[in-house]
Each structure stands twice: as C-alpha cells, then as structure tokens.
Amino acid sequence: TPKIEDLPDHIEVNTGKFNPICKASGWPLPANEEMTLVKPDGTVLHPKDFNHTENFSVAIFTIHRILPLDSGVWVCSVNTVAGMVEKPFNISVKVLPKPLNAPNVIDTGHNFAVINISSEPYFGDGPIKSKKLLYKPVNDYEAWRHIQVTNEIVTLNYLEPRTEYELCVQLIRRGEGGEGHPGPVRRFTTASIGLPPPQGLILLPKSQTTLNLTWQPIFPSSEDDFYVEVERRSVQIKSDQQNIKVPGNLTSVLLNNLHPREQYVVRARVNTKAQGEWSEDLTAWTLSDIVPPQPENIKISNITDSSAVISWTILDGYSISSIIIRYKVQGKNEDQHIDVKIKNATITQYQLKGLEPETAYQVDMFAENNIGSSNPAFSHELMTLPESQAP
C-alpha cells in the first residue's frame, strides 16, 4: 500500500500564499490524480505541481490565500490500486503582524532624523523575527527605501534637506511569507541646511603624534555664535574617533595624542544653533617612527648608450619625503657616485642621462623620511649599449 512520508504532525504557516507538499511512496508510485489534500472544511484540493523521484511521488498544492479560519486538521490522502492511505496533520495559520502606531520622530537635522519606531504594540501574531523602517520623500514616486532595524531608536542618514518624508514600520515574523503589512505612516520634514563647511581645508602631518588642520577665516553672515567642529577618526582603528570644538575665530587646530605611522580621516563643519554641513573627508598620515622600507619593484628599462629609465613603487604610510637614486661606474671609488634626489614622493620613475656607452653602472635606491634613510639590500646593475647600437 502507499505510504505518506515526511509529513510533520504540526505546521505553522503565515497568512497568504501557501504551498503544502505531500510526499508518498509505494508501488505503483501514486499518480498526480491519486493524491489529494483535504481542508478542515472538507474542500478537496488537487496538486498544482507534481513530480516523481525514484521512490516518491511529490504533490505540491497551491493555496493562494490561507487564512486563520483555515487552521485545523488537514488530511493528505493517497488512493491507488494498491490501497488508500490518509495522514492528518495540524495547520496553525498565523496573522501577519502590523504595528498599531506610527513611528515617532525624536530629532531631525538637515540630512538625518532620529526615529522611535514604536514597533509595539502590534496587531497579529509574534514572535517578531525582524523589523524594517520604510521611508521615502512624500513627493517622490520612487519605491520605498528601507533599513533593517534592531533597536527601537534608529537614525536615518543621507536625507535631503528641507524635504517632507513619510515613514512606516514593517514587522516580519518567522516562517515563509512572514512580512506583515506596513503600519501607520508618519510624516516629517528635514531641517534647512546649516552653514557651509570651512573653505581651504588643509591637513598636514606635524609630528609622529600630531596633525595640523587649517582653513580660511570664517566670516558669518549673522550675529549667531558659531564654532568649528572637527571630527577625526583612525582608518586602522575603527573605534578611535574624536570630535573637537574650535572657537570660530581660529583658523587651525592641532590634532594631538595620535599614533605614529597611522592614517586619519578628518572633516569639519561650522555649527551655530543648527549643525552645519560636513566638509569632504581629508586624509593624512602621522609622521613615521621608523626608517622607511626600501622602494619596491625597481626596474631598469629603455637602456640606450647614454641613458636608462628607472622605475619603482613605494609603500604608503611611512612619511617618505624623497627618493635618492645613487649610481656610479662599477669598480670606481665609493666617493665617485652621483646622487639624484627626487623630492616629490609621488614620482615613480626617472631617466638617468649622460651615461657612458658600453659601461657597467651600479645603481642603488633609498627612500628618506623624517627618521632617516632606508637600507638597500642589494645593488642593481645597469649596462649601457655600445654607441653604434643605440637606436
């Protein structure tokens, strides 16, 4: 006789579309006409989809909208020439959750809003697996944007200034199709934009533990008191962040107690009672506390009878101020070398000129920083071409 397989005694489902599966074995394998599903009210359902595996017939039923009143005992029934078998199982249909209240706006700026999502109380069934805050500009026909939220208090960033937004909360319960309908909508308007950021911002390393930020003098258009807020954070250590308030009449601030050889991101804004607009991020490294590493990937190319091109790369973060190329005819005295000092560390190639034809040169490279010079591990050899072979 046929046998119904892998059917749990109890299934919890969410209101909405439901695709129960009834799986049966036996010989002959049940055909799709021979498998049915009986609802608690006696309605007989036939499979919408069906497939055979080596040992099983798998019937997939489709209920376009299952409701709480469909809760109760359902029966999977298989009736073949070999016999009939039925397996009752309990389905508990849950109501999708929906917040009863609209979210509350606690605070707004020109580009942010602090929201209490007010996810409780809610109508429907829990437990709540996750929550979404949906938002969009009122006058936009674009789709709702959303963020997943874990706390009741959440900050929405990157909003447009002086714009009306609408907000609502969607609750998601466990199980497939557990997304509830969004709750009531709250409207709010972001603040007008504050003062523009300081102009002419320059961030330069001062020492191993300090950076200096400078800007052009600020001439406010109103009588309001103002100050410059400077935020600095470490790229390497995410938790290392500090905000400094600088009187409005100053045009620089020394950022101290920093770590050597570390990259920092700095931005500034001018605040009155309202917060100003942040500047673009500036980045800089504090000065190094060790000698720099050697230039890497040193290559000598385009060799002629009197010239050659040397190229290299350097590592970021070691406050390298210059590159020195030292070359001399091989075998000549040490003091007969020529030093080329390249003070722009962003340059990564240089053409050596005025070389002798058919001559072997020894080439060394160094990087220099505030501590000293790098130590070359080995020299590079360069052999110029004979005069007649030059292109």
Epitope: P28, L29, A31, N32, E33, V44, L45, H46, P47, K48, D49, F50, N51, H52, T53, E54, S57, T62, H64
Partner: antibody, heavy 115, light 107 residues
Framework: EVQLVQSGAEVKKPGASVKVSCKAS????????MNWVRQAPGQGLEWMGM????????RLNQKFMDRVTMTRDTSTSTVYMELSSLRSEDTAVYYC????????WGQGTLVTVSS | DIQMTQSPSSLSASVGDRVTITCRAS??????LNWYQQEPGKAIKRLIY???SLDSGVPKRFSGSRSGTEYTLTISSLESEDFADYYC?????????FGGGTKLEIK
C-alpha cells in the same frame, strides 16, 4: 467519466488566427492543468503549453511564447487556445489533454492553414 | 530542450509476439517519463507514467523499465488491439518533449 470535447475543424489563411476550444466534464474543472499538444500530418506530438483553470496560470513552450494565448471560462468549464500569425507549418491536429502529464485527451481539432 | 530519441520508428509484428520500444533521453530525466498509445480514430491514451507505473485499466501485458537514460516499453504478448502508434513523453523539465513515435503494424 472524464470527457474533453473539442471544437470542429478550421481552415485559415496564413497570417490569420485560430481559436480552438476544449469543453471539460466529469471532474473538477479548476483542479487540473489543461495541456495543448499538436500533431502535424504524419508527424509526432509537440507540447505547446498548459493552463491551470483555477488562476489562469500558463506555462508555455518557449517556441510558441509569442503566438499562443491560453484562456479559460470557468462558467462553462472550457479552455481555449488561440494561435496567431498562422503559417502553413501550423497545419496540424490540436489536442487538449487533462492533468500535468496528460492522462485524458480530447478527440483533436484539425486546423488547416492554406492560401 | 531535452531530446527524446525513439526507436524503432516502425515495427511489424504478429499477435502473440513480444515487442519492445525504446526512448533515449539526451540528459538525465530520472523516472519522469510516460508512454502513450494512439489508435486511429480514438483519443490518445496514457499507458504508463513515472517510467514503470501502469495506468488503471491498462492490461498487464504492458510494462515499462529504465536503464540509465534508456527507457523501454514492453508488450509481452501482442493482441490485435495493440496495433497503434506509441509515444514517450519526458516531463522532467519544460518544455515537455515527446519521442518521434513508433508505428506498430501487423506483419
């Protein structure tokens, strides 16, 4: 007893459309898929697609996607298959067949496409 | 699309003979294969579903089997009403595809 009664033979000109019907009885009409299969003269069978009368969901053979429309009328337990932009190679007997894998078949409708 | 190659395309046999018709699938279709009979002037009839399960009302002389991607319909002892066209159908993946058919004629 399951019965599928199809509409009568049709003669159509190239470029025209034809609509074949299949009236079902003897079972719960909205519970089973209805397939459409055709057979050109002296040729084998070719599956065109199917429709589920409960919600009109259709699953079509890609080959016919642009030219076939399957519909149903639950009040009369009838399924329709319309084939447009007819060409001579569409001359065939068109069958409806009940169930996902065709356990009951109609008697067939001959459609002749000729100028 | 999955191709179903059916052989032979025609077959002459006598009442009482044992006959086999085969279908080879171009790729794995598991047991998702049916066999159909088409008699002139009659509705097409499903004989076997899921490779080897006999439809109700179909005589036991019909049987189906499988070896890898080769599927066989066997009629153990031909009767006069068995002379007809036979088709296999794979339903493992859409579009469903039929074999080219086998015409079983009286010798």
């Amino acid at each position: 007893e399951v019965q599928l009664v199809q509409s009568g033979a049709e003669v159509k000109k190239p470029g025209a459309s034809v609509k074949v019907s299949c009236k079902a009885s003897g079972y719960s009409f909205t519970s089973y898929w209805m397939n459409w299969v055709r057979q050109a003269p002296g040729q084998g069978l070719e599956w065109m697609g199917m429709i589920h009368p409960s919600d009109s969901e259709t699953r079509l053979n890609q080959k016919f996607m642009d030219r076939v429309t399957m519909t149903r009328d639950t009040s009369t337990s009838t399924v329709y298959m319309e084939l447009s932009s007819l060409r001579s190679e569409d001359t065939a007997v068109y069958y409806c067949a009940r169930g996902l894998y065709g356990n009951s078949w109609g008697q067939g409708t001959l459609v002749t496409v000729s100028s | 699309d999955i191709q179903m190659t059916q052989s032979p395309s025609s077959l002459s046999a006598s009442v009482g003979d044992r006959v086999t018709i085969t279908c080879r699938a171009s790729q794995d279709i598991g047991i998702s294969l049916n066999w159909y009979q088409q008699e002139p002037g009659k509705a097409i009839k499903r004989l076997i579903y899921a490779t080897s399960s006999l439809d109700s009302g179909v005589p036991k002389r019909f049987s189906g089997s499988r070896s890898g991607t080769e599927y066989t319909l066997t009629i153990s002892s031909l009767e006069s009403e068995d002379f007809a066209d036979y088709y296999c159908l794979q339903y493992a993946s859409s579009p469903y595809t039929f074999g080219g058919g086998t015409k079983l004629e009286i010798k």
